[in-house]
């Protein structure tokens, strides 16, 4: 009955503060409408990073001001989070909701630990 969600345990953000990972869910039924939410957990506090609802076969659309982008392929969602800094290092949880058709299913991943290292400032050249 429970929906399994898989995501990588660890991801290292690029020097430009971009981190990408795949969120894959084992759909118990044939969902046509799916909601994907990225949550950040820090000190047992959970906050929403971004969210998108999409129809199967269509593109994933986040809000214009979102720091996330993504693409979907079947039961797999490729997520990219941009603008990350060292202080954003933490556990990022992929949450999947099968909104339609019934029944509703909720799937929570174990989380991806994203490490972000701020780039060293370039030394002044003489």
């Amino acid at each position: 009955k429970a929906m399994h969600v898989a995501q990588p345990a660890v991801v290292l953000a690029s020097s430009r503060g971009i981190a990408s990972f795949v969120c894959e869910y084992a759909s118990p039924g044939k969902a046509t409408e799916v909601r994907v939410t990225v949550l950040r957990q820090a000190d047992s506090q959970v906050t929403e990073v971004c969210a998108a609802t999409y129809m199967m076969g269509n593109e994933l659309t986040f809000l214009d001001d979102s720091i996330c982008t993504g693409t979907s392929s079947g039961n797999q969602v490729n997520l990219t989070i941009q603008g990350l800094r060292a202080m954003d290092t933490g556990l990022y949880i992929c949450k999947v909701e099968l909104m339609y058709p019934p029944p509703y299913y909720l799937g929570i991943g174990n989380g991806t630990q994203i490490y972000v290292i701020d780039p060293e400032p370039c030394p002044d050249s003489d």
């Epitope: 929906m3 909104m99 029944p103 509703y104 909720l106």
Partner: antibody, heavy 118, light 108 residues
């Protein structure tokens, strides 16, 4: 702080209608799915209905399907429950509840009592 | 529909004692989708445990949850006077959302 305040309960005759409201404050209402849960006098908790973020998707318990309608107005931060064709067995305290980020019902209103009696 | 059965129906204990409440599901529930609530007379339910073993904000550490699959347990290590109440388990992994019938923890 998060607050959910129900209103609209009262005494109503069988077969009549009633509309409950739940005013939400202290959080971004449109970012959360919501539920109504009821509790008959001296009994346990019974889930009644669910509504998605934008109100597009709704789910109902078999006991109320076709009689109750859940809706929301995100511009007013308010959740509603329209109850038609009320029966004596619908007598209960009705609670609105917020779905937490990880799925459980993390905040509940204080409840509003609905009594269906002739 | 996932049916949750709680036992015992009533637990009579004294303050300071350990309380062990059981919740059994009719089919497997992922541990991420099992919650426990506390309800006192005249009050709304309060979330205690989610994800089978994570304590909600502000819940004292004498409350702990465990279990997986179909068998889950809520343990109160040392009962305080304010812990005497009714406790409900709930699954939230799929619709319809379901609750157990409750366990009343009363003063012996």
């Amino acid at each position: 702080q998060v607050q959910l305040v129900e209103s609209g309960g009262g005494v109503v005759q069988p077969g009549r209608s009633l509309r409950l409201s739940c005013a939400a404050s202290g959080f971004t209402f449109s970012h959360y799915t919501m539920h109504w849960v009821r509790q008959a006098p001296g009994k346990g908790l019974e889930w009644v209905t669910f509504i998605s973020y934008d109100g597009h998707n709704k789910y109902y318990a078999d006991s109320v399907k076709g009689r109750f309608t859940i809706s929301r107005d995100n511009s007013k931060n308010t959740l509603y429950l329209q109850m038609n064709s009320l029966r004596a067995e619908d007598t209960a305290i009705y609670y609105c509840a917020r779905t937490g980020w990880l799925g459980p019902f993390d905040y509940w209103g204080q409840g509003t009592l609905v009594t269906v009696s002739s | 529909e996932i049916v949750l059965t709680q036992s015992p129906g009533t637990l009579s204990l004294s303050p300071g004692e350990r309380a062990t409440l059981s919740c059994r599901a009719s089919q497997s529930v992922g541990s991420s989708y099992l919650a426990w609530y506390q309800q006192k007379p005249g009050q709304a339910p309060r979330l205690l445990i989610y994800g089978a073993f994570s304590r909600a904000t502000g819940i004292p550490d004498r409350f702990s949850g465990s279990g997986s699959g179909t068998d889950f347990t809520l343990t109160i290590s040392r009962l305080e006077p304010e812990d005497f109440a009714v406790y409900y388990c709930q699954q939230y992994g799929s619709s319809p959302w379901t609750f157990g019938q409750g366990t009343k923890v009363e003063i012996k």
